[in-house]
């Protein structure tokens, strides 16, 4: 997250970190069910661990943390690397979470976002770009949903209805390491960090997010079919 600020503790209990060995964060994710996460499809890896209820990026033990293995990864069938359409994936955890103030799911919004909606994006991704500098703790950033026209103008021929753009002033954006993390609007999960320009936070080049309102049926059916 570029030019965000430290999230208040306990305010993002659905935020997950996807980790490679040894404790290497590569993506964010979102708890949407006691045993299921949503993340970006481009975050798919064979072997990874899931950390929930953790505030700092470092692997130091925190009392609220819960660690899991991903036992099943189900990318949306319409996703094709390295494209960006349909960029979402469900991850089944090896066990159900223990609900606490630090770990609990968020509902996915069935309403599509309208331009001007205020949202919050979070993650442990780099806070500089193109340099790489990681934060000590989870970062939060207020962003506004942009109209689909502004989105298409920013990225001609690259935007479809499985995506929406959101941003703020130039110099504020999600970035590398934030993929799969939540965009929360009006208390529900509206999007996932997906892609954007490089370097991040360039003027008139907003972040692009997976438009989850288009996938509520697939999410529900996939969880039911695999539970």
């Amino acid at each position: 997250i570029i030019n965000g600020s430290d999230c208040d503790m306990h305010t993002q209990p659905w935020q997950a970190a996807l980790l490679l060995r040894p404790n290497q964060l590569y993506c964010g994710a979102v708890l949407v069910h006691p045993q299921w996460l949503l993340t970006a499809a481009h975050c798919r890896k064979k072997v990874f661990r899931v950390r929930l209820g953790h505030y700092s990026l470092s692997p130091v033990y925190e009392s609220g943390q819960q660690m899991f293995q991903g036992v099943k990864s189900i990318p949306h069938p319409g996703y094709s690397h390295p494209g960006h359409s349909n960029d979402l994936m469900l991850i089944k955890l090896n066990r159900r979470i223990r609900p606490t103030k630090d770990v609990r799911p968020i509902n996915v919004s069935s309403h599509c976002p309208s331009a001007g909606t205020k949202c919050l994006v979070s993650g442990w991704g780099t806070t500089k770009s193109p340099q790489v500098h990681f934060p000590k703790v989870l970062q939060c950033l207020n962003i506004s949903v942009l109209s689909q026209k502004r989105c298409e103008d920013a990225y001609p021929r690259q935007i479809d209805d499985t995506m929406f753009c959101a941003g703020d002033k130039a110099g504020r954006d999600s970035c590398q390491g934030d993929s799969g993390g939540p965009v929360v609007c009006n208390g529900s999960l509206q999007g996932l960090v997906s892609w954007g320009d490089y370097p991040c936070a360039r003027p008139n080049r907003p972040g692009v997010y997976t438009n989850l309102c288009k996938f509520t049926k697939w999410i529900q059916e996939t969880i039911q079919a695999n539970s």
Partner: antibody, heavy 126, light 107 residues
């Protein structure tokens, strides 16, 4: 078949210019960042330049900064390297290489260069 | 710039031998290291990415390990087609830099 084919190399005098081209086929060129890498005779690999998929980010090795210009034409599936003020030490085989890392995607995961051309030889000599 | 130091610069080995090549970065690069194989007159070929992930189509006798500053490429049982020069490369930070190479020769 995924393929990169370089062209444009040759013999040039010190201070001269050359333009290298790299034609891509078998994949969606505008989804990938690209690189130029060179190898002087009997020496190791040296990264020369990088360009992101949308051309929004470009970088160069210090040894070529201000003299070389990387560009791409996604409509033509082509990558270019304009080389000016050439020096004897620029003599090398020049490879174009596809970068497997999508810098547009916002995961923190880096791969490397998975597809390389056969190389084109540049000789700078009087 | 990040310096990549490979050792040894050359190694003589026989078919069936286990060969280990090391690469050291001048500063931490997490797991973001790639290994390439290059045969004379040919372009390099990506073997391993993210320090330990095998590129599609690469034989399982090749393996990589390490993170931070110290990395290793191992060929568990050297085959005739493995005699080549091997390069490491750090990929997260511009300018990208390669190690000086390790030539694996027939003993």
């Amino acid at each position: 078949e995924v393929q990169l084919v370089e062209s444009g190399g040759g013999l040039v005098q010190p201070g001269g210019s050359l333009r290298l081209s790299c034609a891509a086929s078998g994949f969606t060129f505008n989804d990938y960042s690209m690189n130029w890498v060179r190898q002087a005779p009997g020496k190791g690999l040296e990264w020369v330049s990088y360009i992101s998929s949308s051309s929004s980010y470009i970088d160069y090795a210090d040894s070529v900064k201000g003299r070389f210009t990387i560009s791409r034409d996604n409509a033509k599936n082509s990558l270019y390297l304009q080389m000016n003020s050439l020096r004897a030490e620029d003599t090398a085989v020049y490879y174009c290489a596809r970068d497997l890392t999508s810098m547009q995607s916002r995961d923190y995961y880096y791969y490397g260069m998975d597809v390389w051309g056969q190389g084109t030889t540049v000789t700078v000599s009087s | 710039d990040i310096q990549m130091t490979q050792s040894p610069s050359s190694v003589s080995a026989s078919v069936g031998d286990r060969v280990t090549i090391t690469c050291r970065a001048s500063q931490g690069i997490s797991s973001w290291l790639a290994w390439y194989q290059q045969k004379p007159g040919k372009a390099p070929k990506l073997l391993i990415y993210a320090a330990s992930s095998l590129q599609s189509g690469v034989p399982s006798r090749f393996s990589g390990s390490g993170s931070g500053t110290d990395f290793t490429l191992t060929i568990s049982s050297l085959q005739p087609e493995d005699f080549a020069t091997y390069y490491c490369q750090q990929v997260p930070i511009f300018p990208y830099t390669f190690g000086g190479g390790t030539k694996v020769e027939i003993k």
